[in-house]
């Protein structure tokens, strides 16, 4: 028998730097968790005391924090080389800044291969981008060799801006035959590498004969054997054991997100390549496990570039942003129309002509806005005051709802209304009107949403078996601030860019603006 | 295939400059950084810099940073190194090599550059 | 500067033999070591990188190990093509070649 080790982190978002048990920011440095410092720790820790070891990453490490806005993907790629990366995925936000932007800091500057078997380049970025992703990679480990096939969501045209002349194809229909080329160069031991979510992990361990480990991203997916060391509570056991169709138990696993994890998985394999056990569970990286002096110390280097960007303007107004607790719990605040206005922007993927946007819907509940910025500053707009207004790190996600769930939410927003509660809805492409003299449930006296099958947008009445696509923060999708209908009722979730930095590309595009409240939400005549 | 086109030999004068090329083809020229190598007749290769095509970013060893200066013709897939002040000490074959995964992969044949009175 | 101490700087070896050859470094490279193979009058040729990975159409004979600060380039049975000079590069922190071993046949 033969013993590999696999370690493995997914949807990291940037948090190269350690942070709270949440992954906001390293607020009490005694209970700050991850970080790329702290995770050389670990692996190496691991690498010394193991044979035959592979660290892995099943993509999303672009996009989350400042580091990301400032440094574009050098960050990763500088780090991703100090920790000594095996091989990584790629995940649907490496495309966030276009074909290039993964090129250029990622691609061109990884000492370790980048994998994807289902993302097929056509046109002139075939030969452009020829040979610097893959299929897949054949690792020599010890003695032996593994096989790394990598894959990505389908999805990525919808969630990423990946441009035109990238196919992406179903990851099955991709795969099997990368795992039968692989099986006659002799390769017996294959990992598929991915990121599509959780349920697309257990239908590839099912579906790709060959396949012996997948190792996942994209849904955030905790996974643990036992009692969990943290908050965070385990969708099943680690590893996830599927039955595959040609009857073998294929480990699943994945490691929920943020680098607040190690994945650790041991496999043991017989001389034919077959798995013969797998155990092993998430290390969680907390403060026990000390950073890495010398990468913490690279950490501080590359660190004093953000500071001096958090003070540089990014763009003016020339109205103030009123994103009072006053207004935005209450009515409709030029902040809020602002922050959606800029959540759909970044959502514009022409993918159909039948449609002029795949989304045109967005919801923020008013108490995730933390603060108004004053015009009377010049007009300045900088990344620090933005970071006041939306302070939790969250991201702006994609989901999928049926009309019937949209119109609970809606109640959800007044259902007590005039507390002063973080649940009033500010939107972008919604148009609805209360009845607050009307029991609470029944208040929402009209709701218009603006079409996306058209070629000139125009606002119809909601459609309660109709699924519409929404942009809304990851704490709603979450259920935060009540709306639990949202998290049970929702038909697909796809988490998106991190909020501040969708805002602040907005205002710098946009350059100058100038937001007004416009009669988004209103209040029949004599109830308010 | 891949292939670093370098011409065989170059004769330059003491005090001169001279302009060495490396034509690449079968793949994109700006999706990969290029690497310059020198070798001194019967002795081990030594690292001189690299560019990446399509920023025109340098990376140089120290001790050559005032001697190479590197460039690239985009519109030709044309790598370039000019040396200067030439003497008898940068006499040898130079090398362009492309870069992948942080090291070297594919070869240019080198050109011989003598420094001769 | 990272230096990279290769040995021997010569040898002889008869065919069908195991051959190593040895790097080491002057600090922890991180298994970023490359080896290359040049013939007289040739450009040089890559054979492994990330200290054990093969470059494609690489006879299986050759193989690389090592971590931290020492590697080796072994030729599990030597054949006469193999004769040549082998060298290794660092690439962690910019690059460093070795010295260079000069492999003959007995």
């Known amino acids: 028998a033969w013993e590999l080790t696999i370690l493995h982190t997914n949807d990291v978002h940037s948090r190269l730097e350690q942070t709270s048990e949440d992954s906001s920011k390293c607020v009490n440095a005694s209970r700050c968790m991850g970080g790329v410092a702290r995770l050389f720790t670990k692996v190496q820790q691991i690498r010394r005391a193991e044979p035959n070891v592979l660290l892995l990453d099943a993509g999303d490490q672009y996009q989350g924090t400042i580091w990301f806005t400032v440094y574009k993907g050098a960050e990763v790629a500088h780090f991703m080389n100090a920790l000594r990366y095996d091989a990584m995925a790629l995940g649907n936000h490496e495309f966030d800044n276009g074909v290039e932007g993964l090129i250029e800091p990622l691609l061109k500057e990884a000492k370790f291969p980048i994998l994807s078997a289902n993302i097929k380049a056509k046109g002139p970025l075939a030969s452009q981008i020829s040979g610097l992703y893959l299929p897949y990679k054949v690792l020599p480990v010890g003695d032996e060799v593994v096989g790394i096939v990598g894959y990505t969501s389908k999805e990525t045209p919808f969630l990423s801006n990946p441009g035109t002349n990238l196919v992406f194809e179903d990851e099955i229909t991709a795969l099997q035959p990368e795992v039968d080329k692989l099986k006659t160069l002799n390769v017996n031991k294959i990992i598929a590498l991915g990121h599509s979510g959780f349920e697309m992990d257990k239908l590839i361990a099912q579906k790709v004969r060959g396949v012996d480990v997948v190792v996942g991203g994209h849904s955030n997916t905790f996974l643990y054997t036992g009692n969990p060391p943290s908050k965070e509570v385990p969708a099943g056991k680690y590893p996830f054991i599927v039955t595959s169709d040609d009857g073998r138990k294929v480990p699943v696993v994945q490691a929920y997100a943020f680098g607040k994890y190690l994945g650790y998985l041991k496999i043991e394999f017989d001389e034919r390549g077959n798995v013969i056990s797998s155990h092993g569970n998430p290390i969680l990286l907390n403060s026990s496990i000390p950073e890495d002096p010398s990468i913490k110390a690279d950490i501080n280097k590359w660190r004093i570039k953000l500071d001096n960007y958090s003070t540089q303007e990014l763009g003016k107004t020339i109205v103030y942003l009123d994103g009072s607790s006053q207004s935005c719990r209450f009515r409709e605040c030029n902040m809020g129309n602002l922050i959606c206005d800029a959540m759909i922007n970044n959502n514009l993927r022409h993918t159909d002509e039948m449609f002029w946007n795949h989304v045109s819907m967005c919801i923020l509940n008013g108490g995730g806005i933390r603060s108004p910025i004053d015009e009377r500053n010049n007009g300045t707009i900088t990344w620090e005051n933005l970071a006041a207004v939306l302070p939790f790190g969250g991201t702006f996600d994609l989901v999928q709802l049926k009309g019937s769930t949209l119109k609970k939410a809606f109640e959800h927003s007044v259902h007590r209304y005039g507390q002063s509660t973080g649940e009033f809805l500010q939107v972008g492409g919604i148009h609805v009107v209360y009845d607050l003299s009307r029991k609470p449930g029944d208040r929402v006296v009209k709701l218009d949403v603006l079409c996306t099958k058209c070629r000139v947008p125009s606002y119809d009445p909601l459609k309660m078996d109709e699924v519409y696509k929404v942009i809304l923060p990851n704490f709603l999708a979450n259920g935060g601030d009540g709306f639990q209908m949202i998290k049970d009722e929702l038909l697909r979730h796809d988490s998106g860019d991190q909020d501040i930095n969708v805002v602040s590309t907005y205002i710098s595009k946009m350059k100058v603006i100038y937001p007004a409240v416009e009669g988004r939400i209103k209040f029949s005549t004599g109830s308010h | 295939q891949v292939q670093l086109q370098q011409p065989g030999a170059e004769l330059v004068k003491p005090g001169a400059s001279v302009k060495l090329s490396c034509k690449a083809s079968g793949y994109t020229f700006t999706s990969y950084w290029m690497h310059w190598v020198k070798q001194r007749p019967g002795q081990g290769l030594e690292w001189i810099g690299e560019i990446n095509p399509s920023i025109g970013r340098t990376n140089y060893n120290e001790k050559f940073k005032s001697k190479a200066t590197l460039t690239v013709d985009k519109s030709s897939s044309t790598a370039f190194m000019q040396l200067s002040s030439l003497t008898s000490e940068d006499s040898a074959v130079y090398y362009c090599a492309r870069r992948v995964y942080g090291t070297m992969d594919y070869w240019g044949q080198g050109t011989s550059v003598t420094v001769s009175s | 500067d990272i230096k990279m101490t290769q040995s021997p700087s010569s040898m002889y070896a008869s065919l069908g033999e195991r051959v190593t050859i040895t790097c080491k470094a002057s600090q922890d490279i991180n298994s970023y070591l490359s080896w290359f193979q040049q013939k007289p009058g040739k450009s040089p040729k890559t054979l492994i990188y990330r200290a054990n990975i093969w470059v494609d159409g690489v006879p299986s004979r050759f193989s690389g190990s090592g971590s931290g600060q020492d590697y080796s380039l072994t030729i599990s049975s030597l054949e006469y093509e193999d004769m040549g000079i082998y060298y290794c590069?660092?690439?962690?922190?910019?690059?460093?070649f070795g010295g260079g071993t000069k492999l003959e046949i007995k």
């Open positions: 590069l660092q690439y962690d922190e910019l690059y460093t």
